[in-house]
Amino acid sequence: MGSRRGPWPLVWAVLQLGWWPGWLLDSPDRPWSPLTFSPAQLTVQEGENATFTCSLADIPDSFVLNWYRLSPRNQTDKLAAFQEDRIEPGRDRRFRVTRLPNGRDFHMSIVAARLNDSGIYLCGAIYLPPNTQINESPRAELSVTERTLEPPTQSPSPPPRLSGQLQGLVIGVTSVLVGVLLLLLLTWVLAAVFPRATRGACVCGSEDEPLKEGPDAAPVFTLDYGELDFQWREKTPEPPAPCAPEQTEYATIVFPGRPASPGRRASASSLQGAQPPSPEDGPGLWPP
């Protein structure tokens, strides 16, 4: 009788895979900077507040912290500043910078976001003479979506790192996954209640052993998930401990090895670290 292995290793592998989209957004496409600006992608509905966090690596004695939006010509338009920027002409009071108690983190908020607030944002720290220096954070993207009339869904909202397009996918996938897990649980319960002639068979294959199907194999439930972008940031699940032989019938989830399409990665790789504006646009943030 060919040995069969339960779904836990696969579920564990799926959960492991679930780490990668979030990791991808953090690095390596976003080089280290003395400033961080997060989340890398933020989606809010119009009318809601949109809040980024700008964080300093350390707290210098004298600095000015500014918040910028990137213009279509790749120039930085200043929105607001820590220290109030008391004399800026035409300040839009919807843009607010608040220093948090730890001194290193600053909330940069758009009050009642509008559709045309969608765009690329960043923060910049200006350390003035004698060591004049301007540091830019990596860019971040804000998407302001039209307000929908339907009530908010009950499922927990994904972390703000996910783009709007990914949110629906993750919610859908999560629902399917929960359904599958419930199905598995039901299978186990049924197997426990109605034991079959599998007495004595050990279902604990080694971790490295590939899936096998003998002639007496149970039916295989094949779920083609395609590309799954899980955004779970939980503790890595422990691989299942070795088990004793039991009478349970196991359903197997098979994930076909389909490569991820390049387009999926773009959501991360398009958010590159701060690049100096192109020469034809002039120096941008830096005075000439």
Epitope: R86, I87, G90, G282, G284
Partner: antibody
Framework: EVQLVQSGGDLVKPGGSVRLSCVAS????????LYWVRQAPGKGLQWIGG????????NFSEKFKSRATLSVDKAKNTAYMQLNSLRAEDTAVYYC?????????????WGQGTLLTVSS | DIVLTQTPPSLSVSPGEPASISCRAS??????????LHWYRQKPGQPPQLLIF???NLESGVPDRFSGSGSGTDFTLRISRVEADDAGVYYC?????????FGQGTKVEIK
């Protein structure tokens, strides 16, 4: 080389209006705010107002709020000040000047100034 | 409005001698490491020239004979060794709040 070149100063009758121009070159126009300062003959410097070339936003000295209009033409890298309801005491040299938008610094470059004379 | 009072109103200095001008603000113009006060020199028939920004920072191209100090409400511009070219009217200006204001000026003449 950074330059602010002014024009538009003239002899104007009381009650009239004037539009002064300030053409900026040698730097990224939207990275600096532009301000207007005037100096009456033999007197000190008086701030009028400022404009943000990125968004056209303005601020003014209370004294000039009702009579001055500040604007920019980004395509021409030019700032304008229109002053209405002119009176004799508006006779002065008018300067445009700039400051870095990154912080509340000083005015690092100035136009050459343009003389406005208000007289009947 | 913040009033900036400069003293003395005028100053006559011999070349090579030091000179200092004081600027007192009617309220503090300093916060967390910065003082929002700047110094200019204006020669006859010319626009003002920025000498010192943020109280103590020498503007690019300005000789290091010039220095600025102070915080809160009291500020000083110093010229370590006056030269003939330093004649003109010196102004302080704040950028703390609206309206921006200038001191009334200190006229420096070279003996």
């Amino acid at each position: 080389e950074v330059q602010l070149v002014q024009s538009g100063g003239d002899l104007v009758k009381p009650g009239g209006s004037v539009r002064l121009s300030c053409v900026a070159s040698g730097y990224t126009f939207t990275s600096y705010y532009l301000y207007w300062v005037r100096q009456a003959p033999g007197k000190g410097l008086q701030w009028i107002g400022g404009v943000n070339p990125s968004n056209g936003g303005t601020n003014f000295s209370e004294k000039f709020k009702s009579r001055a209009t500040l604007s920019v033409d980004k395509a021409k890298n030019t700032a304008y000040m229109q002053l209405n309801s002119l009176r004799a005491e508006d006779t002065a040299v008018y300067y445009c000047t700039r400051r870095d938008s990154n912080y509340d610094g000083g005015f690092d470059y100035w136009g050459q100034g343009t003389l406005l004379t208000v007289s009947s | 409005d913040i009033v900036l009072t400069q003293t003395p109103p005028s100053l006559s200095v011999s070349p090579g001698e030091p000179a200092s001008i004081s600027c007192r603000a009617s309220k503090s113009v300093s916060t967390s490491g910065f003082s929002y006060l700047h110094w200019y020199r204006q020669k006859p028939g010319q626009p003002p020239q920025l000498l010192i920004f943020l109280a103590s920072n020498l503007e690019s191209g300005v000789p290091d004979r010039f220095s600025g100090s102070g915080s809160g409400t009291d500020f000083t511009l110093r010229i370590s060794r006056v030269e003939a070219d330093d004649a003109g009217v010196y102004y302080c200006q704040h950028s703390w709040e609206l309206p921006l204001t200038f001191g009334q000026g200190t006229k420096v003449e070279i003996k």
